[in-house]
Structures are given as C-alpha cells and as structure tokens.
C-alpha cells in the first residue's frame, strides 16, 4: 500500500534533528572593527562631524573573536530559533584554496568556517560539514581547475584530496560528521555535452570521495573518530502506470542509473551497477549511442569498495517514470527513461510532487540493496512561495517524517538524521527556506521546533525527555550571553 | 595580460613542409585551455587546423589528420604547428589561438595571435 | 562535420541602424556558437560566447540569441567601428567549423 495511517512514536535520543544549508561564502573580514583599533577619537559633532583622532593615547582592544563575522550572528540566531541539534552546510572550495592547490591557502576563510562551528557547538548544535557542493549555476571549482577540464581530468581528484586532508587537519577536532560531495549523481546535469563526459566525471568524483575517505581513515580517524560519506540525491521512483511492465522497469532503471551508479561502487561491489552498465553496452550494440561506463581497474575497485562510513541521501518528491526509447549519447538519453507529471498530486511551486511515501520505500529500497547501515537524510524539504505561513512546507515535514518515522519503528531502518532543506532562502531563488531572504522567520520553524521538542509524534503519556549523557545540555547561561552579544 | 605570437618562414616551397611555432606569455600551457591553430585562406575562409591540451593531448581536423601535428617545448611555453606536403591551396594566415575548457566559465577562443602570412609558391 | 551557414555574405546598414547576422548548423550544436569580429589586417575579436554570452569589455549593442540549429548576432544601434567582417563559429564539435562570413559596410 502506498499510504498507511499515522504512526505514534519517536525518534531515538541520538538522532539528528537537521537543517543544512548550501555553500557558506566566508566573510574575508570581520565587520566589528572597532574592538580591535586601539585609537581614541573625538567626535567633532557640530562642526565637520569627522572622527579626529587623540594622538598620545592608546586604548586596550579585545582579541577578534567569531561573533565580529555579521553573516556568522545572523546564522546563529536563525539557528538558535531552529532548536536543531545539528546544522549542515557547505564550505567554498574556491575560496579556500583560489589555486586549486596547497600553495595559497586562504586562512581566514579556514578561520571564518571554524567560527561557524565553535559557535555552533556554544549553542549544542553540531555540524556536519560539506566539502564540495556544485550547484547547475556554479561548478565551484577553483578557477585553475576548471581551465584544466575540470571533473572530466583525473589530476582534479587528487587536488581533491589534498584540499579534503586541509579540511580534516583544520577543522576535523570540531566536526564528526563530513560530506565529502554533494549530489555528485546531479553533476550529470553540467557534464552533458555526452553520456562519456558525464560518466567520466562521474568517475573522477567517485575516485575523489574514495581519496578523501582513505585519507581520513589513515591519517584523521584515529584522533579526531569522525564519519565520512557522500550525499546523493536519491528521489523514489514509480510506474506512471502500474499495469505496465516496462514502467515497472523503467522505474528501477532510474535507481539505477541515479542512486546505484554511485552506490554500488561505494557500498557493495567497487563498480558500477551490472544493470546499468549492460543497459548502456545493449543500447551500443545496437547504435542508439556512443556511452559507455568506464571501465574500473582492479586497483580502482578496490579503492572505491567500502569508503563510505554511513548512507547519505537527499530526498525531495517521488517520479513518476515510464519507459521511452530514446537515440543519442548523453545520460538523458542513455536510461530510456519519460517523466510525467501527475497533476492530480499536491505539488509546489517548482512542481515538486509531495508524496510522503516515497522515502519510506527509499530507505527500504537502500537497505534490501546495500545491508543494514546507518542512514541520514541529509537534506529533504519544498519550496513554498508563503513569506509567513508556509503551510505547504508544514504537511510536508509532517508527512514525511511520518514516513521516515515508520521506516524506523515498523521497517526497522537504522535512520540516524534528519536534515530540512533549508535554513534561509535565496534572494530570486525557488522559496525552500525556513527564513526568507532577510531573514525573516516563517511559521513552519515552530512546528519542527515541536516535532524536535517531542522527538517525533509521541503518545499523549509519553515523555520527550532523554537522560543527560544522550542528549546535550543546554547551558542556558551560555545561551543568553551568546544572543546578548555584540 | 595573455599574449599569443606566432613566427615562421613566410615563403614555403610545394612539398616542403611548413613549421611555425607560436609563443605564449602571461600564461602557462601546461596549466590549462585548449592551444589551437586555426589559418584563414585568401578568399577569408576560416579553418581550424587542430589543438594540443594543457596534458599534451592533441586533436586534429580530419581533413588534414594525416598531414598535420601540433606538438610544444614546455620549457620555453612555446607550441608548434608542422603541416607536411604543403600545395598553393595551403597559403593562408595562420593564427594560434587558445580555448577554454568545456565547463569552465569561458569555453571559447579568447586570445589569438597577431597571425602569420605564409605562401606556398615554388 | 558541422557545417555552418551564413547569411548575408555581406550587407549595407546605416549609422544608428539595427543590425541582424544570421548562423544556420547542420545539426543541434547546444549554444556552443561563439561570435567574431575581424577588422582589415587584425586578427578576429571574440564577440560573444555560448550563444548569448557577452565577452567582458565588448559593448553591450552587441547580443546574441539563438538555440538548437539556428542563431542570430544582434547590434542594435550600428556604429561607425563595426564595420568589418563577422563570423560564427560552432564549437560543440571537434572539427570546430566556422561559418562563410559576413561582410558589414556603412551605407
């Protein structure tokens, strides 16, 4: 059955109450700088109104400290207004590193994102931290590497590693939990000029996450005793019509070709799914396309097998699928696949269908296929063009958390996190912010306040508490100073 | 600034072959872009001749694969254009030219040489 | 290969006047169409890139348009420096193939 009643129950002490954000631009300087200059002046107020300076004295400043970042005081107080236990977000690998190489490393970007995390963790919240999160507008890869092809040249994944260890060393003491990539089964919709650009930067990232993952097992793990994954994005698919086989087939084609493409290799066996590489060598053989996947050398497969700590996925709407041959050499075109919009279904404004069920069978899905692990979800939630009562994105979070909720108590999925997508909006940008663009709240932050409050939909005479040692203490001291801070 | 030089004789005999070499300041051709020769004939007609990668790779115009190689010195920043078996009809300006890489935010030709006038004539 | 048509070969326009050049490709090329502009003895100018991109420091009269097959160079108020000649040129595909030219004079 695709909908079930409401489930009553929580969520387990540790589990993650998220909310994740995309790429952080770092402030290159703090915006109080008064605190560090140590100059008297006199306000001329009447006369010329310009500051002259009292030549002959000085005055004792205070050290920078993390709250002098203005981007960093707002994002704490959204935070604090949030009452999550973790916030994800996303450094800026271009800012870090212009060269693309250890040669010129940008320390008070470094600075700037450690600030982010230790003033998180003043407030409880913890951080999971994304190395590299390319978007359809901006590849965001410093600006040598991309005049080197990019994700198409294999040098860009040992670049990756080296600006992945830098990470590790700089901030890995304050994070524990790490995305190396972002949704790099979505780099198909940049790479596609042909199926073998984009599997072969598919590839490229794929050797990337595994460099990284290695990196920190060896060097990183046995002190710092964090976690390392990839994100990726992981939409359900169903028969458009359930009568039909070849739907039936489409559909677990898309899940092939989107989630197992990159899970397979990490999760099970060290190569791409066999379905998707025979579909591919089929479609070949009978000169409907050009693709292919690149072969993995035995070397690779072992490098890629098992480097994932936990499973990460990023899940919004469930697609309705059908079957469609279709002739050329791009990925598109590759998986045979038609979309259709079901518009009897509840959808938002950028027609993301809202069907709640879809995780459940997600979870279910990656748990028959790649073993009982860990899962988070590391980024789910819709856009809703309401400034204030965002009624839309409100059912949203309940139903799907309702779902994921009974993948944890009835399905017995070992779910771990679950992070809404996300925390402000951007200025023209599609509206999928629990804050607007100017940092206005909306209404939906005191229901996932509440769900968070009570650990999910708890029975009437069940308590929400957890023992000390799980949950963290909040010092309310700490917290009150922390908001009363220049 | 990126500045792209071609030189090279002016004057080749038929079935000679032509070499030209064009010189890159401002930037290194090892670091990045697509380094391409490109000759425009007579009558203003525009050929691309092929290109060499920052990796050393090269790729040329079928038309002229099997006369044609693009090879550099790295040391000197410098890439090279040879064209054997050259006809009256391979009398043109040639022209270095470099090209962005696909995906990068610019991924066209951006900066061409002054060009060179080579003629083919006995 | 990508074969690029296009027209006219050459035209007349006056000073102020809107100015349109046309790029026909043999198959899809998927905006990776850039636009030249070549004064007599000078090496040519990339005007603009991916079809509707304009290169840093050209003047914002020039535009491009287009997607697929077809595209089109736009000037819209003619200048006494735009005389010259202009090209496109296709660069989905290697061999990169460049269209026959078009020869824009002042009437």
């Known amino acids: 059955k695709e909908s079930t009643p409401d489930v009553q129950g929580q969520f387990p002490c540790d589990f993650s109450w998220g909310v994740t954000e995309s790429v952080l631009k770092p402030e290159s300087v703090a915006s109080s700088p008064q605190f560090s200059d140590p100059h008297l002046y006199v306000w001329n107020a009447t006369g010329n109104r310009l500051l002259h300076r009292v030549e002959g004295v000085r005055l004792k400043t205070r050290p920078a400290q993390c709250t002098d970042f203005v981007n960093i005081k707002k994002q704490l107080e959204m935070l604090a207004r949030m009452k999550v236990t973790h916030y994800r977000f996303a450094l800026d690998w271009a800012s870090v590193l212009p060269t693309g190489n250890l040669s010129a490393v940008n320390r008070q970007a470094l600075r700037y994102y450690r600030c982010v995390v230790s003033e998180g963790l003043k407030l409880g919240i913890s951080a999971m931290v994304t190395l590299y999160y390319p978007t359809h507008a901006h590849l965001g890869l410093p600006e040598p590497l991309l005049h080197a092809d990019g994700w198409l040249n294999p040098s860009t994944a040992e670049a990756f590693q080296a600006y992945a260890g830098l990470c590790f060393q700089e901030l890995g003491d304050l994070v524990k939990l790490w995305i190396t990539i972002n949704e790099p089964n979505r780099l198909s919709d940049i790479y596609n000029r042909s199926g073998n650009d984009t599997y072969g930067a598919a590839h490229n990232l794929l050797v990337a996450h595994a460099l990284a993952w290695r990196l920190y097992d060896r060097q990183f793990r046995p002190s710092q005793r964090g976690a390392v994954s990839l994100s990726l994005h992981a939409d359900w698919a169903e028969p458009a019509n359930p009568y039909a086989d070849s739907h039936w087939r489409a559909a677990e084609r898309f899940l092939q070709f989107e989630i197992a493409w990159f899970a397979e290799p990490l999760f099970k066996t060290g190569d791409y799914p066999a379905a998707m590489r025979e579909y591919i060598a089929s479609k070949h053989r009978r000169g409907l396309s050009s693709s292919a996947l690149p072969r993995l050398t035995e070397a690779e497969r072992r490098l890629l097998k098992g480097t994932v700590d936990f499973c990460a996925l990023n899940h919004f709407t469930t697609r309705f699928v059908m079957h469609e041959q279709l002739a050329g050499s791009r990925y598109d075109s590759d998986r045979d696949i038609q979309f259709l919009q079901d518009i009897t279904r509840l959808s938002s404004p950028t027609r993301l269908a809202v069907i709640p069920w879809g995780v459940r069978k997600l979870l279910r899905w990656v748990r028959r296929n790649y073993g009982d692990m860990d899962i988070y979800i590391t980024a789910s939630g819709i856009d809703d063009q309401a400034l204030e009562d965002d009624r839309l994105r409100k059912y949203y979070l309940g139903k799907y958390l309702q779902e994921v909720l009974k993948a944890y108590l009835i399905d017995k999925v070992r779910i771990k996190g679950y992070y809404a997508f996300k925390l402000a909006e951007e200025k023209s940008k599609p509206r999928f912010g629990f804050f607007t663009s100017d940092f206005k709240a909306k209404s939906s932050i005191q229901f996932y306040n509440k769900v968070i409050s009570s650990r999910g939909f708890p029975f009437e005479n069940s308590s929400s508490r957890c023992s000390q040692t799980q949950e963290n203490t909040e010092c309310t001291v700490c917290l009150f100073l922390v908001q009363k801070k220049p | 600034e990126v500045q792209l030089q071609e030189s090279g004789p002016g004057l080749v005999k038929p079935s000679q072959s032509l070499s030209l070499t064009c010189s890159v300041t401002?930037?290194?051709?090892?670091?990045?872009?697509?380094w391409n020769w490109i000759r425009q004939f007579p009558g203003n007609k525009l050929e691309w001749m092929g290109y060499?990668?920052?990796?050393?790779?090269?790729n040329y115009n079928p038309f002229l694969k099997n006369r044609v190689s693009i090879t550099r010195d790295t040391s000197k920043n410098q890439f090279f254009l040879k064209l054997n078996s050259v006809t009256t009809e391979d009398t043109a300006t040639y022209y270095c030219?470099?090209?962005?890489?696909?995906?990068?935010?610019?991924?066209?030709?951006?900066?061409w040489g002054q060009g060179t006038s080579v003629t083919v004539s006995s | 290969d990508i074969v690029m048509t296009q027209s006219p070969s050459s035209m007349y326009a006056s000073l102020g006047e809107r100015v349109t050049i046309s790029c026909k490709a043999s198959?899809?090329?998927?905006?990776?169409l850039s636009w030249f502009q070549q004064k007599p003895g000078k090496s040519p100018k990339t005007l603009i890139y991916?079809?509707?991109r304009l290169v840093d420091g050209v003047p914002s009269r020039f535009s491009g348009s287009g997607s697929g097959q077809d595209y089109s160079l736009t000037i819209t108020s003619l200048e006494f420096g735009d005389v010259g000649l202009y090209y496109c040129l296709q660069y989905d595909e290697f061999p990169l193939t460049f269209g026959a030219g078009t020869k824009l004079k002042i009437e």
């Open positions: 401002g930037y290194s051709i090892t670091s990045g872009y697509y």
């Open positions: 030219t470099r090209k962005g890489a696909y995906y990068s935010s610019f991924d066209a030709l951006d900066y």
């Open positions: 991916r079809a509707n």
């Open positions: 060499i990668r920052y990796d050393g790779n090269s």
């Open positions: 198959q899809d090329i998927r905006s990776y």
